[in-house]
């Protein structure tokens, strides 16, 4: 075998693949959950039909020191066109209910599975 130059950069992930990978990660979290996820941390509930990806990140980014959701946080940061920092609530217009991270992940997973089934990759 001959080496023909350097490494080719991996192609961009199609939206459908990106969504599937996020779903797989959320499934992984829910299936591997033994102790309370993120020590039972509470996060803002979001409207899953309104600018969901940035809103989900704005909610989850405020959970620190929880390795179980770090990959999810990273993935969601790639799903949002603007940079999200802890304490930022621009997409989270309504902040009236807090839920446990575990419940948040389950709700997000159910909604993303529905979108995937319907072919809504945007």
């Amino acid at each position: 075998l001959t080496c023909l130059g350097g490494f080719a950069s991996p192609g961009p992930v199609p939206p459908s693949t990106a969504l599937r990978e996020l779903i797989e990660e959320l499934v992984n979290i829910t299936q591997n959950q033994k102790a309370p996820l993120c020590n039972g941390s509470m996060v803002w509930s979001i409207n899953l039909t309104a600018g969901m990806y940035c809103a989900a990140l704005e909610s989850l980014i405020n959970v620190s020191g929880c390795s179980a959701i770090e990959k999810t946080q990273r993935m969601l940061s790639g799903f949002c066109p603007h940079k999200v920092s802890a304490g930022q609530f621009s997409s989270l217009h309504v902040r009236d209910t807090k839920i446990e991270v575990a419940q948040f992940v389950k709700d997000l997973l159910l909604h993303l599975k529905k979108l995937f089934r319907e072919g809504q990759f945007n």
Epitope: L19, A50, S77, P81, S90, N122
Partner: antibody, heavy 118, light 109 residues
Framework: EVQLVQSGAEVLKPGATVLISCKVS????????MHWVQQAPGKGLEWMGR????????KYAPKFHDRVTLTADTSTDTAYMELSSLRSEDTAVYYC???????????WGQGTLVTVSS | QAVVTQEPSLTVSPGGTVTLTCRSS?????????ANWVQQKPGQAPRGLIG???NRAPGVPARFSGSLLGDKAALTLSGAQPEDEAEYYC?????????FGTGTKVTVL
């Protein structure tokens, strides 16, 4: 005052590589994503990609992913766009633009004209 | 890859109202497309007007407003001024990349 100042026009031969800089002032470069947009003469806007200057994480448009590299130097508050294997159809004005929730595409560089000609 | 289409050209009278639309080939535009609208005048760099479907950028006059209209994103210009004559582009976010629309040339006549 927020400003994005890009490097000057370039004339290059097919197959060459161009590096365009975008120096920002009036804010800290790591606070926002930097997006890059191409506009060929008389044509519309085409999104090329974006970078998080804080950690170098990038997203690229499918059309450009194998030829474009976005980087940032936080010590000089400068973002860079490198486009390789240039061809005549890459002749265009290239813009850097800051994007955030409260200022979507609100700030743009002045544009850098790249001419690819043999 | 998705294709984002806009009306090629629209004409509005001074003081009148015009609505530009932005359609996605992949289906209905939703709030998760974070629809953006950008204005460009000849020989100038573009200028962001609207992001996140209906969020006006700083310094943008209130006569520009964004919304979802049926299955499309829309930009409404109410009380058009001569200086609003320009090319307008929408940009939709598809999970991990933007796609700009074909552009609409707005003439104030």
């Amino acid at each position: 005052e927020v400003q994005l100042v890009q490097s000057g026009a370039e004339v290059l031969k097919p197959g060459a590589t161009v590096l365009i800089s975008c120096k920002v002032s009036g804010y800290t470069i790591t606070d926002y994503y930097m997006h890059w947009v191409q506009q060929a003469p008389g044509k519309g806007l085409e999104w090329m990609g974006r970078i998080d200057p804080e950690d170098g994480e990038t997203k690229y448009a499918p059309k450009f992913h194998d030829r474009v590299t976005l980087t940032a130097d936080t010590s000089t508050d400068t973002a860079y766009m490198e486009l390789s294997s240039l061809r005549s159809e890459d002749t265009a004005v290239y813009y850097c633009t800051r994007y955030d929730y409260y200022g979507p595409f609100a700030y743009w560089g002045q544009g850098t004209l790249v001419t690819v000609s043999s | 890859q998705a294709v984002v289409t806009q009306e090629p050209s629209l004409t509005v009278s001074p003081g009148g109202t015009v609505t530009l639309t932005c359609r996605s080939s992949t289906g209905a535009v939703t709030t998760s497309n974070y629809a953006n609208w950008v204005q460009q005048k000849p020989g100038q760099a573009p200028r962001g007007l609207i992001g996140g479907t209906n969020n006006r950028a700083p310094g943008v006059p209130a006569r520009f407003s964004g919304s979802l209209l049926g299955d499309k994103a829309a930009l409404t210009l109410s009380g058009a001024q001569p200086e609003d004559e320009a090319e307008y582009y929408c940009a939709l976010w598809y999970i991990n990349h933007f796609i700009f629309g074909t552009g609409t040339k707005v003439t104030v006549l």
